[in-house]
Interface confidence: medium
Amino acid sequence: EEELQVIQPDKSVLVAAGETATLRCTATSLIPVGPIQWFRGAGPGRELIYNQKEGHFPRVTTVSDLTKRNNMDFSIRIGNITPADAGTYYCVKFRKGSPDDVEFKSGAGTELSVRAKPSAPVVSGPAARATPQHTVSFTCESHGFSPRDITLKWFKNGNELSDFQTNVDPVGESVSYSIHSTAKVVLTREDVHSQVICEVAHVTLQGDPLRGTANLSETIRVPPTLEVTQQPVRAENQVNVTCQVRKFYPQRLQLTWLENGNVSRTETASTVTENKDGTYNWMSWLLVNVSAHRDDVKLTCQVEHDGQPAVSKSHDLKVSAHPKEQGSNTAAENTGSNERNIY
């Protein structure tokens, strides 16, 4: 009679976490008499998974009744699989011996892979805003996937980025894995509407990869440009001075008018106009009663944007060119801001 062979027909078995794995094993003969044991791994450090003769294996059930005399099916089911169960499982036939059973023949092994999808990537940007031409870092994290192989890409507005570093942890064998990547992005003035995308592709996903996004509007600060101009005289002794605050982001902005260094009025940008690139424009104006001034007036528009140090622009108002009106002591009217778009 031919010598007994232990057949493990499946080279590999894939199971989703939480499910049951079936590991198939059959023997080609009833002889020699002796039990079957299942192990994970080979060699001296192998782990006993199931012993037909003795022991308690709560997660393991046999596919057929091993107590039947003519049984040659030694397949098992392992319940509630986790990624920690991944490995190669061997079905081993023992020959009845005295005092101990002797290992007789092993199957070729079945590799159990546990699949787990990566979590949706989470992209986070810097804690503080940065201005154009500066380089900022974005991080992307995804967790809980298995097997370890994974691909991560970065995009800015659909264009792939190359300046990034990625780590998959842990380095060795593990229950499941995490990926962490840091990308460097150079900001431009046009980035208010830009998006940074982290894309993760894994063998458990079908079709399109998972994506995480960050809006650069949360990261960028575009400082304003200021222009102070003198408008034509509205009345014989009044001059209209405007301060155009252009191309700023975010909207948080406070403007102060100074006459010869003294605060005349402070206001907060409320009704702004939005440019196509997502930045804002705003205009404030001041009516100056020139008859109240003997000398030339230095008008300063001072802007504090998004909590940053103030920037300012000045305009020298020539008083000598205007006839003085007797008895007038009002230097400026609190006119509020002009809400029209100046473009």
Partner: antibody
Amino acid sequence: QVKLQESGAELVRPGSSVKLSCKASGYTFTSYWMHWVKQRPIQGLEWIGNIDPSDSDTHYNQKFKDKATLTVDNSSSTAYMQLSSLTSEDSAVYYCASYGNYGENAMDYWGQGTSVTVSS
Amino acid sequence: DILMTQTPLSLPVSLGDQASISCRSSQSIVHSYGNTYLEWYLQKPGQSPKLLIYKVSNRFSGVPDRFSGSGSGTDFTLKISRVEAEDLGVYYCFQGSHVPFTFGSGTKLEIK
């Protein structure tokens, strides 16, 4: 061995719905995506969508988004496709197919097909 | 959606001849994971389709070595080195890289 057993032929009225089934055996049902494919008489194959039984994650061909609903019952290792608001355009053979070879993402195994005829 | 264009629509051959079917995708079908999920299926009359080739050039188990797949990017080819009677039917290419997955229109291999 792997087998995908689809439900029998259906003759249905226009405007009604039908639920097709695909019972899987011989492999771990939750480990592989299940696909559904349409074939009209003397025509080619159209991919309808797929479902991951482990978490009911689905992808649809937009063309079938309002037509087909994919579900699974893991306890019976069965995948279902419900087709709604049926018209003569839905008369076709519908196949289920499974990715049986992990990591290769190919439809290794196919059901025998279910013929759906929409007629008044 | 990615359009898969197969040529020819019909391919008359003599038994023992070589047959070649072309499949062109309207855009690259390299998946983000790096693989190209281009498959070839054969559907014989009255039967379900059967997988022949996966990932461009890998023969599925049990498929004779007279079948071979090649190509990259957007251009792919299925070759049958010596056509046998059991090879007759309709061949479909399929991309499984980008949702929605799409089939080619099919090529009917028939006897001259």
